[in-house]
């Protein structure tokens, strides 16, 4: 597959950030920004927490998720589990692309039952048009949003 | 904002190393080497720890820093927030753009007293010309610089 | 030195995805897969663990390693070294380029002794034709590779 | 300037106690490790114990485990080792020292002159 | 605990000699380890941390290197006030060790 840069062409690029909304408890993958602040589309389109392929290429993909808790929830997996998948009419399942595991919970001391850890993803993949990318989050209920600085997903053709 | 990838054009790209010089302890972000080793600035520029923009668009931006100890000084949040940041005629006050927060120092254990840990930010922003980006830590004073290989600060137009 | 994107030239990219023989004990890099899967080369190559430049130029270049042990390896030290490493005809030892070190095993809890992290490396780096780009994690028994999407390595032109 | 100054040392009758203490001068005291390493005669360098900066964490070597008792006082910028059921084989100077553990800097930078225990009957 | 373990014990050596003296640890310690200097009725001075950083104020004729299990403080060219002994001492892991020290005499 060969795939060109036209100069007269604008590369697409998004940068989707987090949101009080972001995490639904619905088992789905994470929803983002896409508007306000630091969140911008272009030439990608956004449906449901899915960067969504309107020009196939290959793309530079990324998501940071910003953990943290006090101790660990009761019944949580130590494991954390941050990843981007990708959805394609060809395949009823969603496709691993790039995973992280973490056990950010033993990172809480003797002097602060506080803790923060954060999981940074990003490669090269191949998209065509139509195909989406998500980010999942197992368990959400540790991933932690405020401004959007701090969880966002993003994409750009390389 | 139709941003165009001319063929006739260098690319903008820069990669900052950190340095013997790069903690000041003033309170101001990390300084950094430009020419020397793996740094250079292409279609960018430094200003005091800053990298600026020249050519408005989207930019990959994105630092790592090394951090280490041996347990963790008192004073010290055991929060370590690790941050890139804007600067921009427009506004009296850094705007936050990418942002990490670990709590590394609970690494050490009884078989090891000395830590490390790594912090990785990277997203596709918005910058207009003469805009400027910088990178911040809180508590600067666990980042390991020395080498240039372990702390550094970059970016590339998409 | 001034490199320039030409229209009608593919842009050189490459993402290499873990498998069961990336790991040798040998002492040597990582080795990857570079077709099934995710795997791909476009205008890179590939030799014993190296991506291989043939078009001079500057690279963002990244890769993720995914680390996991239950407790810690008697005899391994508390820090482990991810880095990306280039080897040039015109120097007899590997130069580093990026580097993390962290100690995950720490992360280890009361609750449960089996532990994960994740470490993450990318920046640019110029890179002539033919010099090569290795990854090495010192200790390697501490690397989970599984299906290709937790530990990688790739790279493309800027 | 930087400084350590021990004192407290002296003489001992096997089986008693002594209190070193180590005042610290010209840097943040709260920021550092502790160590107490010791040196009998003609002997190379043995470290007793060390104290966190933060938690106050506390480590020891086994020769001296439920025996010796490490503490600060970030307040009066003061360490201090309490020496219980003293032995002949404790006999030796006992240096505090600073440690850092930032990032860049590791390691004890900064030994006071030391102080002398002499355990004997 | 982990054993350092230094050689020579002792060397007999001249002012302008370039004198090596190693260090081994009994298990990986990365490159936890420094490198003090003790003059007689002196106190020790760190001369060397991480394995092969320099001192602030020690003079470049010292160099450290290795890391895991193997290490080495070389003098390029031994000065008067650098006839001593020297120790190597793992921060790594507790309980903390020393070195059994390398003496370094005039010949």
């Known amino acids: 597959l060969i795939q060109e840069r036209r100069s007269h062409e604008v590369n697409p690029a998004a940068h989707l950030t987090g949101a009080n909304s972001s995490l639904t408890g619905s088992g789905g993958p994470l929803l983002w920004e896409t508007q306000l602040g630091l969140a911008f589309l272009r030439g990608l389109s956004y449906h449901d927490g899915a960067l969504v392929v309107t020009k196939a290429g290959y793309y530079y993909i990324y998501s940071k998720v910003q953990l943290g808790g006090v101790g660990c929830p009761l019944g949580l997996a130590s494991t954390i589990t941050h990843g981007l998948y990708k959805r394609t009419p060809r395949y009823p399942e969603e496709l691993e692309l790039l995973v992280s595991q973490q056990s950010p919970c033993g990172r809480a001391t003797s002097s602060s039952r506080v803790w923060w850890d954060s999981s940074f993803l990003g490669g090269v993949v191949h998209l065509e048009a139509g195909e989406e990318v998500v980010v999942r989050v197992l368990d959400e209920r540790l991933v932690r949003l405020r401004d959007g600085t701090r969880s966002y997903f993003g994409a750009f053709m390389v | 904002l139709i941003q165009e990838r001319r063929s006739h054009e260098v690319n903008p790209a820069a990669h900052l190393t950190g340095a013997n010089s790069s903690l000041t302890g003033s309170g101001g972000p990390l300084l950094w080497e430009t020419q020397l080793g793996l740094a250079f600035l292409r279609g960018l520029s430094y200003h005091d720890g800053a990298l600026v923009v020249t050519k408005a668009g989207y930019y990959y931006i994105y630092s790592k820093v090394q951090l280490g100890g041996v347990g963790c000084p008192l004073g010290l949040a055991s929060t370590i927030t690790h941050g890139l940041y804007k600067r921009t005629p427009r506004y009296p006050e850094e705007l936050e753009l990418l942002v990490s927060q670990q709590s590394p120092c609970g690494r050490a254990t009884s078989s090891s007293r000395v830590w490390w840990d790594s912090s990785f930010l990277g997203g596709v922003v918005h910058l207009e010309a003469g805009e400027e980006v910088v990178v911040r830590v809180l508590d600067e004073r666990l980042v390991r610089l020395r080498d240039g290989t372990r702390s550094y600060f970059g970016a590339f137009m998409v | 030195l001034i490199q320039e994107r030409r229209s009608h030239e593919v842009n050189p990219a490459a993402h290499l995805t873990g498998a069961n023989s990336s790991l040798t004990g040998s002492g040597g890099p990582l080795l990857w897969e570079t077709q099934l899967g995710l795997a791909f080369l476009r205008g890179l190559s590939y030799h014993d663990g190296a991506l291989v430049v043939t078009k001079a130029g500057y690279y963002y270049i990244y890769s993720k390693v995914q680390l996991g042990g239950v407790g810690c390896p008697l005899g391994l030290a508390s820090t482990i070294t991810h880095g990306l490493y280039k080897r040039t005809p015109r120097y007899p030892e590997e130069l580093e380029l990026l580097v993390s070190q962290q100690s995950p095993c720490g992360r280890a809890t009361s609750s449960s002794r089996v532990w994960w992290d994740s470490s993450f490396l990318g920046g640019v780096v110029h890179l002539e034709a033919g010099e090569e780009v290795v990854v090495r994690v010192l200790d390697e028994r501490l690397v989970r590779l599984r299906d290709g999407t937790r530990s990688y390595f790739g790279a493309f032109m800027v | 300037q930087v400084q350590l100054v021990e004192s407290g040392g002296g003489l001992v009758k096997p089986g008693g106690s002594l209190r070193l203490s180590c005042a610290a001068s010209g840097f943040t005291f709260s920021d550092y490790y502790m160590n107490w390493i010791r040196q009998a005669p003609g002997k190379g360098l043995e470290w007793i114990a060390d104290i966190s900066s933060r938690d106050n964490t506390i480590y020891y070597a086994d020769s001296v485990k439920g025996r010796f008792t490490i503490s600060r006082d970030n307040a009066k910028n003061s360490l201090y080792l309490q020496m219980n059921s003293l032995r002949a084989e404790d006999t030796a100077v006992y240096y505090c020292a600073r440690e850092r553990g930032f990032g860049d800097y590791f390691g004890m930078d900064v030994w006071g002159q030391g102080t002398t225990v002499t355990v004997s009957s | 605990a982990i054993q350092l373990t230094q050689s020579p014990s002792s060397l007999s050596a001249s002012v302008g000699d370039r004198v090596t003296i190693a260090c081994r640890a009994s298990q990986d310690i990365s490159s936890a380890l420094a490198w003090f200097r003790q003059t007689p009725g002196k106190t020790p001075k760190l001369l060397i941390y991480?394995?092969?950083s320099l001192e602030s104020g020690v003079p470049s004729r010292f160099l450290g290197s290795g890391s895991g299990t193997d290490f080495t403080l070389t003098i390029s060219s031994l000065q008067p006030e650098d006839f001593a002994i020297y120790y190597c001492?793992?921060?790594?892991?507790?309980?903390?060790?020393f070195g059994g020290g390398t003496k370094v005499e005039i010949k």
């Open positions: 991480d394995a092969s």
């Open positions: 001492q793992q921060f790594n892991t507790y309980p903390l060790t």
